[in-house]
């Protein structure tokens, strides 16, 4: 039974040209994390593998930094970065848990962070 839950940073906004940290946290399960994938829609941004460490997709190398922890830092944000981001936890023996974050990149300087919320 997949008992775990993923807590994410939820709906967040940030300023164009700035940076943002995407974070997920898996709880309420005894399962062991082997790999975490970060995806934007259908594009792979980065992988954090238990043995191999971090791999950032070549097309994002200049603007994506690993961490903190299993999170991901997006830098030099553009309006085109607005959209859905997914953290996909590959765990033993439960399988995959997926968390969703919606990022809005704003032109103005009034970007505010959304509240944290639970994804079952």
């Amino acid at each position: 039974m997949m008992t775990g839950t993923i807590e994410t940073t939820g709906n967040i906004s940030a300023e164009k040209g700035g940076s943002i940290i995407l974070q997920c946290h898996l709880s309420s399960t005894t399962a062991q994390v082997t790999q975490v994938n970060w995806e934007q829609q259908d594009q792979l941004l980065a992988i954090c593998n238990a043995d191999l460490g971090w791999h950032i997709s070549p097309s994002f190398k200049d603007r994506v930094a690993p961490g903190p922890g299993l999170g991901l830092t997006l830098q030099s944000l553009t309006v085109n970065d607005t959209g859905e981001y997914f953290c996909i936890y590959h765990t033993y023996p439960d399988g995959t848990y997926t968390g969703r974050i919606f990022l809005e990149v704003l032109e103005s300087s009034v970007a505010e962070h959304g509240a944290r919320f639970q994804i079952p």
Partner: antibody
């Protein structure tokens, strides 16, 4: 390369306990779960449980609950499985196997430890 | 507890293709059962071939492939080699425990 090396064969009397070890090398021990599986002579495989090597939390198959204890020594990358109140039906080869969450399952296996229970 | 069933024995000619299946007494096998296939040769350690239905293990030849077929998990060996003669076990995950099948003895003849 990944290796799981188990302790040697044991002969035990009914009612006794046995402790089998599984020493891992070639990877970061605390990044992957460890399973214990047994195979009685001429029989199939039976899963006994697994232990989260990061938290140390074990999960036991219902059949072995109360009789099996799975532990770790992370300083030596070794997993242990202790089975108590042994009976003749526990005569089997006991295997450790690594649990991988990327494509869920057991990817590497130890060579096995024969435990014979006989009076 | 669920019962996992496999063909007791199968024979394939060298270079031929053979499919081993793995069924569940609880109904159709799905990706949630994370079907595993392991190979056992006499006097050798078990070798993990397939994990998570179709994930080939490290160093496992491409002739081994896993899938779901007609409500069962399947292991297909395309272009069987003499060294593929072995016992093959499948394992299915049922919420909180693994159950192994009885094994298939594959003969390459």
């Amino acid at each position: 390369q990944v290796q799981l090396v188990q302790s040697g064969a044991e002969v035990k009397k009914p009612g006794a306990s046995v402790k089998v070890s599984c020493k891992a090398s070639g990877y970061t021990f605390t990044n992957y779960g460890m399973n214990w599986v047994r195979q009685a002579p001429g029989q199939g495989l039976e899963w006994m449980g697994w232990i989260n090597t990061y938290t140390g939390e074990p999960t036991y198959a219902q059949k072995f609950q109360g009789r099996v204890t799975m532990t770790l020594d992370t300083s030596t990358s070794t997993a242990y499985m202790e089975l108590s109140s042994l009976r003749s039906e526990d005569t089997a080869v006991y295997y450790c196997s690594r649990g991988n969450g990327y494509y869920v399952g057991m990817d590497y296996w130890g060579q096995g430890t024969l435990v014979t229970v006989s009076s | 507890q669920a019962v996992v069933t496999q063909e007791p024995s199968l024979t394939v000619s060298p270079g031929g293709t053979v499919t081993l299946t793995c069924g569940s007494s609880t109904g159709a096998v799905t990706t949630s059962n994370h079907a595993n296939w392991v190979q056992q040769k006499p006097g050798q350690a078990f070798r993990g071939l397939i994990r998570g239905t179709n994930g080939r293990g490290s160093g496992v030849p491409a002739r081994f492939s896993g899938s779901l077929l007609g409500g069962k998990a399947a292991l297909t060996i395309s272009g069987a080699q003499p060294e593929d003669e072995a016992e093959y076990y499948c394992a299915l995950w049922f919420s909180n425990h693994w159950v192994f099948g009885g094994g298939t003895k594959l003969t390459v003849l």
